[in-house]
Interface confidence: low
């Protein structure tokens, strides 16, 4: 006869490991007992359990409640055992020794491999700002056994680099993703992908990129000069910009306070029925935590009684400064 077993048994941490040992012999042969042992290079052979055809299963106290026979129905020639709730310390070599009658004893060794699936963690880098050079966007760390694979899935252009640290029973892999921040990356997903034989599917952690920026400011509302006439209602100036974090807007008048009745509502400056007193230089001030920008426009309200006057639509210079 001969023993049917496996060279390697692979199990995920926390699962039950079936250690196979089946005696395939002649019909009249019997299995008397199966002795299971852990083979440790330092401590030698340690008894795990004894499976006796008559007396049943005896488990070493160190493995109490952890070693069982597979559920019935069981073949009398099957000496396999279940090791419940496999932990990393169970990893190693095991031996089954089968005593048969009348053929004598047979033995086989197998290796138990306990996969430790990684629990990845993603750590965002420092705040990203447009204008920075190559900057750490995020790092992703996963520790497992064997070493996990850590990669990045993203449409964003960048560079990735990995390093690993080996632990006695596992390996930690950290991958860093560096990029040159630009506003087009804002809101883009950066996904850490961790692959491991102990995972049914890749583990993915997504980080949404936030890149701080502030666009140039401009003012809309002076496109049609004929609208800026004395008596016209509903005239507005709208300040245009965009940024991350979203910017705040403020309006001032360069040559004095805002005229009576002129209302600031966020990015919009609303005028009451126009008078010549509304002529002047208006400044839109846009700011966020990163920067601030100004755009100024000159408004001249046309009096229809004075046809010689034209509306001045000059947009003056734009200014900005970094915080």
């Amino acid at each position: 006869g001969e023993l049917e077993t496996s060279d390697v048994v692979t199990v995920v941490l926390g699962q039950d490991a079936k250690l196979p040992c089946f005696y395939r012999g002649d019909p009249d042969e019997q299995v008397g007992q199966v002795a299971w042992a852990r083979v440790d290079p330092n401590e030698g052979i340690r008894e795990l359990a004894l499976l006796h055809s008559k007396y049943g299963l005896h488990v070493n106290p160190a493995y109490e409640d952890r070693v069982e026979q597979p559920p019935p129905p069981r073949d009398p020639l099957d000496g396999s055992v279940l090791l419940r709730n496999a932990v990393q310390a169970d990893e190693g070599e095991y031996e089954c020794r089968v005593s048969t009658f009348p053929a004598g004893s047979f033995q086989a060794r197998m290796r138990l491999r306990v996969l430790v699936p990684p629990l990845p963690s993603l750590n965002p880098g420092p705040p990203l700002e447009e204008g920075q050079g190559l900057t750490l966007a995020a790092s992703c760390t996963a520790e497992g056994s064997p070493a996990p694979s850590v990669t990045w899935d993203t449409e964003v252009k960048g560079t990735q680099s990995s390093r690993s640290f080996t632990h006695p029973r596992s390996a930690a892999v950290t991958s860093e993703f560096h990029l040159v921040p630009s506003r087009s990356m804002n809101g883009q997903p950066l996904t850490c992908v961790v692959s491991h034989p102990g995972l049914l599917q890749d583990r993915r952690i997504t980080h949404t990129l936030q890149v701080a920026f502030l666009a140039e400011a401009s003012v809309r509302g002076l496109e049609d000069q004929n609208l800026w006439q004395v008596g016209r209602e509903g005239a507005t100036l709208k300040c245009l910009s965009e940024g991350q974090p979203p910017p705040k807007y403020n309006w001032t008048r360069l040559d004095g306070p805002l005229p009576s009745g002129v209302r600031v509502k966020g990015d919009t400056l609303g005028f009451p029925p126009l008078t010549t007193e509304h002529s002047g230089v208006y400044v839109c001030h846009v700011s966020n935590e990163l920067s601030s920008r100004d755009s100024q426009v000159t408004v001249e309200v046309l009096d229809p009684e004075d046809p010689g006057k034209q509306v001045d639509l000059v947009s003056a210079s734009h200014h900005h400064h970094h915080h």
Epitope: L136, R163, S164, T166
Partner: antibody
């Protein structure tokens, strides 16, 4: 500014245990983002990494010393310590503690203690 | 473990001249390589990390290059305070290792 300071006996008897402590000032060990390492340098020779520890207690040792070395951390005192057992004259060296900013750059030992000389002799 | 071999063991150069130090790894360490300067009685000081990035406060006369297994530290114009022992160090895989050092001395 983070500073590291080694302390411990400068003389240890053969077969005894070398014990050193590194006190971190100017920053908290438990803030994360750093490993804390021990490195040694025998007189007139090069540098050898002994091992590193994270504030959570996870340790990584040089296999050549692993059977004799223990590194542990005391976050309440902002210290981490080294124990090296069964020492011989070959363990005579300047012992440095150092900070390893990992995983973020510079991810190499960027801050070092000034070192403490330990002689193994009877 | 990864073995780092530095050459030459001793390099004699005159102040103001250029010095080129080499470090070779027994297997690829990607760009996980640092350079340190050590003066007598002092702790090592980080000069370069990531093979080519200068550490904080390091003068721009120090530059690093290389990737994989071959790395170079270049000091463009030697100042009197640059004469010391230089070590390379790989931190790509455990155990972390150092090179044997290159002693840079005044010619």
């Amino acid at each position: 500014q983070v500073q590291l300071q080694e302390s411990g006996p400068g003389l240890v008897k053969p077969s005894g245990t070398l014990s050193l402590t590194c006190t971190v000032s100017g920053g908290s060990i438990s803030s994360g983002g750093y490993y804390w390492a021990w490195i040694r340098q025998p007189p007139g020779k090069g540098l050898e990494w002994i091992g590193s520890i994270y504030y959570t207690g996870s340790t990584y040792y040089n296999p050549s010393l692993k059977s004799r070395v223990t590194i542990y951390v005391d976050t309440s005192k902002n210290q981490f310590s080294l124990k090296l057992s069964s020492v011989t004259a070959a363990d005579t060296a300047v012992y440095y503690c150092a900070r390893d900013p990992f995983p973020e750059p510079p991810d190499a030992f960027d801050i070092w203690g000034q070192g403490t000389m330990v002689t193994v002799s009877s | 473990e990864i073995v780092l071999t530095q050459s030459p063991a001793t390099l004699s150069v005159s102040p103001g001249e250029r010095a080129t130090l080499s470090c070779r790894a027994s297997q690829s360490v990607s760009s996980n390589l640092a350079w340190y300067q050590q003066k007598p009685g002092q702790a090592p000081r980080l000069l370069i990390y990531g093979a080519s990035s200068r550490a904080t406060g390091i003068p721009d006369r120090f530059s690093g290059s290389g990737s994989g297994t071959d790395f170079t530290l270049t000091i463009s114009r030697l100042e009197p305070e640059d004469f010391a022992v230089y070590y390379c160090h790989q931190y790509g895989s455990s155990p972390l290792t150092f090179g044997g050092g290159t002693k840079l001395e005044i010619k």
